[in-house]
């Protein structure tokens, strides 16, 4: 008996061939021996089976002795043995229809679990193997689970169902809902305007939800909500904002926040959370602000940084076009009795400058100027 595998929702064509290459009488029946379809001369006739509306044949092939049974919009319950009767012969075809679906939704939050469930006909014992967009293979039976989804899991999952040495392939598009970056650091000189951007790693037709930015300033003992906002069909509207600092928010995606000026008291870490409508859980992005200040007080030139810096970052003070006078893995450096000239304060990581602030030291009889 020939075995054919089908996919739920698809169309399958079961073949039946006569030795005579001409149109002769044929019938397709199900395992209950109830007629599905057949011919009466050149006319297609249909029986009362449940396939009545979804069954068809190709009249154009009848003259060649081919009498296919086409079943559209396959259902699991269409799994059956189909019998083609032609020229006093019976050809049997066993059709097994499978369905593969993702748990509840194909749009999942980063960190959530993906469960793929295989629908299969009674009596079948299929095996399933799925390959994620990043090439990870998972195997299972009726259900397959992947915990802690990552951004790289977004894309087309290819799953192969194996039964009776035959295979059928399913493709499922999974969208992992996340921000493009889990964390970002903004380096600014004191007084500069700060731009925070929170681009999403996915696009959907309609995006609705609400969000909030909590901020933990380095100098503060507790965190504080800086802004809350709503998102309706990709339009952003601010609900509540603190007076200090008075953040501004863009009205369109990507989510965009502006801090009028970087001040040491604002340096620290923030956590932007976004709760999406009809989703349990929230999207998170961490944002860090590092602020630099260079000052000269009497005979002391000081450079300081505030905010979350890594211990390997180097803070240096140097006179322009000269070697660094002082370089330390600390958050403050100073030079006593600095020479007149343009001094540079540099925050660098393995030689790469992250932040730079210039201060002009005048001869001792005049006041310093900050360009």
């Amino acid at each position: 008996k020939k075995v054919v595998l089908g996919k739920k929702g698809d169309t399958v064509e079961l073949t039946c061939t006569a030795s005579q290459k001409k149109s002769i009488q044929f019938h397709w029946k199900n395992s209950n021996q109830i007629k599905i379809l057949g011919n009466q001369g050149s006319f297609l006739t249909k029986g009362p089976s449940k396939l009545n509306d979804r069954a068809d044949s190709r009249r154009s092939l009848w003259d060649q002795g081919n009498f296919p049974l086409i079943i559209k919009n396959l259902k699991i319950e269409d799994s059956d043995t189909y019998i083609c009767e032609v020229e006093d012969q019976k050809e049997e075809v066993q059709l097994l229809v499978f369905g593969l679906t993702a748990n509840s939704d194909t749009h999942l939050l980063q960190g959530q679990s993906l469960t793929l469930t295989l629908e299969s006909p009674p009596g079948s014992s299929p095996s399933v193997q799925c390959r994620s967009p990043r090439g990870k293979n998972i195997q299972g039976g009726k259900t397959l689970s992947v915990s802690q989804l990552e951004l790289q899991d977004s894309g087309t999952w290819t799953c192969t169902v194996l039964q009776n040495q035959k295979k059928v392939e399913f493709k499922i598009d999974i969208v992992v809902l996340a921000f493009q970056k889990a964390s970002s650091i903004v380096y600014k000189k004191e007084g500069e305007q700060v731009e925070f951007s929170f681009p999403l790693a996915f696009t959907v037709e309609k995006l609705t939800g609400s969000g909030e930015l909590w901020w933990q300033a380095e100098r503060a003992s507790s965190s504080k909500s800086w802004i809350t906002f709503d998102l309706k069909n990709k339009e952003v509207s601010v609900k509540r904002v603190t007076q200090d600092p008075k953040l501004q928010m863009g009205k369109k995606l990507p989510l965009h926040l502006t801090l009028p000026q970087a001040l040491p008291q604002y340096a620290g870490s923030g956590n932007l959370t976004l709760a999406l409508e009809a989703k349990t859980g929230k999207l998170h992005q961490e944002v860090n602000l590092v602020v630099m200040r260079a000052t000269q007080l009497q005979k002391n030139l000081t450079c300081e940084v505030w905010g979350p810096t890594s211990p390997k970052l180097m803070l240096s003070l140097k006179l322009e076009n000269k070697e660094a006078k002082v370089s330390k893995r600390e958050k403050a450096v100073w030079v006593l009795n600095p020479e007149a000239g343009m001094w540079q304060c540099l925050l660098s990581d393995s030689g790469q400058v992250l932040l730079e602030s210039n201060i002009k030291v005048l001869p001792t009889w005049s006041t310093p100027v900050q360009p």
Epitope: N32, Q33, I34, K35, Q40, T45, K46, G47, P48, D53
Partner: antibody
Framework: QVQLQESGPGLVKPSETLSLTCTVS????????WSWIRQSAGKGLEWIGR???????NYNPSLKSRVTMSVDTSKNQFSLKLNSVSAADTAVYYC??????????????WGQGTTVTVSS | DVQMTQSPSSLSASVGGRVTITCQAS??????LNWYQQKPGKAPKLLIY???NLETGVPSRFSGSGSGTDFTFTISSLQPEDFATYYC?????????FGGGTKVEIK
Amino acid sequence: QVQLQESGPGLVKPSETLSLTCTVSGGSISTYYWSWIRQSAGKGLEWIGRIYTSERPNYNPSLKSRVTMSVDTSKNQFSLKLNSVSAADTAVYYCARELERPYYYGMDVWGQGTTVTVSS
Amino acid sequence: DVQMTQSPSSLSASVGGRVTITCQASQDISNYLNWYQQKPGKAPKLLIYYASNLETGVPSRFSGSGSGTDFTFTISSLQPEDFATYYCQQYDNLPLTFGGGTKVEIK
């Protein structure tokens, strides 16, 4: 066991719409085809059509332009609407369950029938 | 549609007698034929399916035969409860169609 009960007006005016409902008790409506058959003195038994929850209804071509069938799984009911009626539609209307089993397809459970008269 | 022609339309018979009803299809319907019995004021009841298979619980005095276009229904020894109208019905094609019926009356 499964029982069927037809309900609806016994008298319908010509050109109006005949509406009947069949309530299924003692079983789920979701796993079978359900049909309407009518019996008039002039035409004997006439199959009107059948409906299954997940398929398009099948109607008798002779009535197709006037008939609509629907299923309400939440109420375990299915219904028949026949519009533009005339005296020729006067009949006893039966609802029935259609069953497929090896070598057999037919109506195995019937309602008791409801008489509909078309008259002004 | 498949037309089903039943004959006779009525007949009179005696208790213990033999009754034969014929049904002719307008085209080949293989063995896809049911026979129903209907009593006044009641819904039809299945007696024979697939031309010759006796439905469970139906007395063996009822039988059916034939295939293709010509079918026969027989009651070998008529009982008082058998006086009713009998219908053939094809299920080879949709729409399902019935014969015009044969009324069996007491002689």
